[in-house]
C-alpha cells in the first residue's frame, strides 16, 4: 500500500512512519463568493465542531436548511430538492502518553454545502 | 503548534514526527451513485487528478457548466449563477530517496460541486 | 451507527387521534432532515413525512396531508407525528430514519432501521 516500504526495504519499525514536520501550503485558503450559503436557491447554515487533539482542530459542516429549493420570488418550490455535497477529507488525529506522542491518519465525511437538483423519486408532489 | 511536543519534553529529532499506519474510518465512502451533478440546476463536470505520491492519489475536481442556472425548462437563466463550493483538504505527499521514506503534509483546494445563486451584482441583465 | 426508538403506537378508532415519538442518537453533525415512513401488512414501506433540523421545513406524502404535521426538538434530538383524523388505511408499522440526503433519500439507501411502532386504526 501507499504506506508499506518497497518490498526490498526493511520494515517500518513499530508499525509508524515518519512524519515530517510542516505542512506544504498551510496557508492557502478557500477564496468562496460571498454569503454563497444564504444566497443559494438551496440554502445552508454552518456548525462548527472543535477537538483540540485533531488537525485541523475546527471542522465545519453544511446543513442544507430546507428540503426543497428556494425560487426566484423567495418561495420555497418543492417539485426540486436541496440535497447535500460531500467530500471526503484527511484530518490527523494526536495520541499522547505523557511525551510520546504519535499521529494517526483520519477520514472524515464532510458536507460542503447543498445544492438543488430535479429529484429521481417523487416523495412530494 | 499542533505538531509540536510539550514544552517539557525533550525536542523531536531531525524534525519529524511518529506517524501511525492505519486510517481511521479508511472505509468511509461518499455515496457518488446520485448523479446530483448533473440533475442540479447548477450542474458540473469532473476533473482526476492523478499522482501515485500523494495520497489519496486521486484528486477530483469540479467545474461550474454553465454561468447561470439551469431552470426548469432545461434553458440557462442567466439572472442567475452557478458557483463553485470549496473546500480545504489534506493530502499526504510521499518522499522517498532509497529505503528512507518520509510523509508530508499538504493542504489542497477542492472544488466539491455547484450551487445556484442570486447574484451580488447583475453584470448581466 | 444511528440508533433509531420509535413509540406512541396503539390502537385507535377511526378518526381518533395519536402521537409518534422518535429518540435519535449517533446522528453526524451533517445531518439534516428525519423522515417518517410506514408499512402496511403485505405492501411496501412508504415515505410519510419528512423535517428539516435546521429551518423546521415539513413535507407530507398526499395521503396524510392536512391530517399529520410533523414537528423536532433539536436539543432532545427527538422527532414527532401528530396523526390526527386516522383512517384506516394508516394501519401500519411506523419508522422514522434519518433522510441525509433530504427528500433525495432513496429506501435502498438505508441500512439500519429501527423496530417501528404499531398504529392500528379500526372502524
Known amino acids: 500500500t501507499f504506506f508499506q516500504k518497497p518490498e526490498s526495504c526493511p520494515p517500518v519499525p513499530g508499525g509508524s512512519m515518519k512524519l515530517d514536520i510542516g505542512i506544504i501550503n498551510e496557508n492557502q485558503r478557500v477564496s468562496m463568493s460571498r454569503n454563497i450559503e444564504s444566497r443559494s436557491t438551496s440554502p445552508w447554515d454552518y456548525t462548527v465542531t472543535w477537538d483540540p487533539n485533531r488537525y485541523p482542530s475546527e471542522v465545519v459542516q453544511a446543513q442544507c436548511r430546507n428540503l426543497g429549493c428556494i425560487n426566484a420570488q423567495g418561495k420555497e418550490d418543492i417539485s426540486m430538492n436541496s440535497v447535500p455535497i460531500q467530500q471526503e477529507t484527511l484530518v490527523v488525529r494526536r495520541k499522547h502518553q505523557g511525551c510520546s506522542v504519535s499521529f494517526q491518519l483520519e477520514k472524515v465525511l464532510v458536507t460542503v454545502g447543498c445544492t438543488c437538483v430535479t429529484p429521481v423519486i417523487h416523495h412530494v408532489q | 503548534t499542533f505538531f509540536q511536543k510539550p514544552e517539557s519534553c525533550p525536542p523531536v529529532p531531525g524534525g519529524s514526527m511518529k506517524l501511525d499506519i492505519g486510517i481511521i474510518n479508511e472505509n468511509q465512502r461518499v455515496s457518488m451513485s446520485r448523479n446530483i451533478e448533473s440533475r442540479s440546476t447548477s450542474p458540473w463536470d469532473y476533473t482526476v487528478t492523478w499522482d501515485p505520491n500523494r495520497y489519496p492519489s486521486e484528486v477530483v475536481q469540479a467545474q461550474c457548466r454553465n454561468l447561470g442556472c439551469i431552470n426548469a425548462q432545461g434553458k440557462e437563466d442567466i439572472s442567475m449563477n452557478s458557483v463553485p463550493i470549496q473546500q480545504e483538504t489534506l493530502v499526504v505527499r510521499r518522499k522517498h530517496q532509497g529505503c528512507s521514506v518520509s510523509f508530508q503534509l499538504e493542504k489542497v483546494l477542492v472544488t466539491v460541486g455547484c450551487t445556484c445563486v442570486t447574484p451580488v451584482i447583475h453584470h448581466v441583465q | 451507527q444511528v440508533q433509531l426508538v420509535e413509540s406512541g403506537g396503539d390502537l385507535v378508532q377511526a378518526g381518533g387521534s395519536l402521537r409518534l415519538s422518535c429518540a435519535a442518537s449517533?446522528?453526524?453533525?451533517?445531518?439534516?432532515?428525519m423522515g417518517w415512513f410506514r408499512q402496511a401488512p403485505g405492501k411496501e414501506r412508504e415515505f410519510v413525512a419528512a423535517i428539516s433540523w435546521i429551518s423546521g421545513d415539513t413535507k407530507y406524502t398526499d395521503s396524510v396531508k392536512g391530517r399529520f404535521t410533523m414537528s423536532r426538538d433539536n436539543a432532545k434530538k427527538q422527532v414527532y407525528l401528530e396523526m390526527n383524523s386516522l383512517k384506516p388505511e394508516d394501519t401500519a408499522v411506523y419508522y422514522c430514519?434519518?433522510?441525509?440526503?433530504?427528500?433525495?433519500?432513496?429506501?435502498?439507501?438505508?441500512?439500519?432501521w429501527g423496530q417501528g411502532t404499531q398504529v392500528t386504526v379500526s372502524s
Open positions: 430514519n434519518d433522510m441525509p440526503y433530504g427528500l433525495d433519500t432513496r429506501m435502498d439507501e438505508y441500512v439500519y
Open positions: 449517533g446522528l453526524t453533525g451533517s445531518s439534516y432532515a
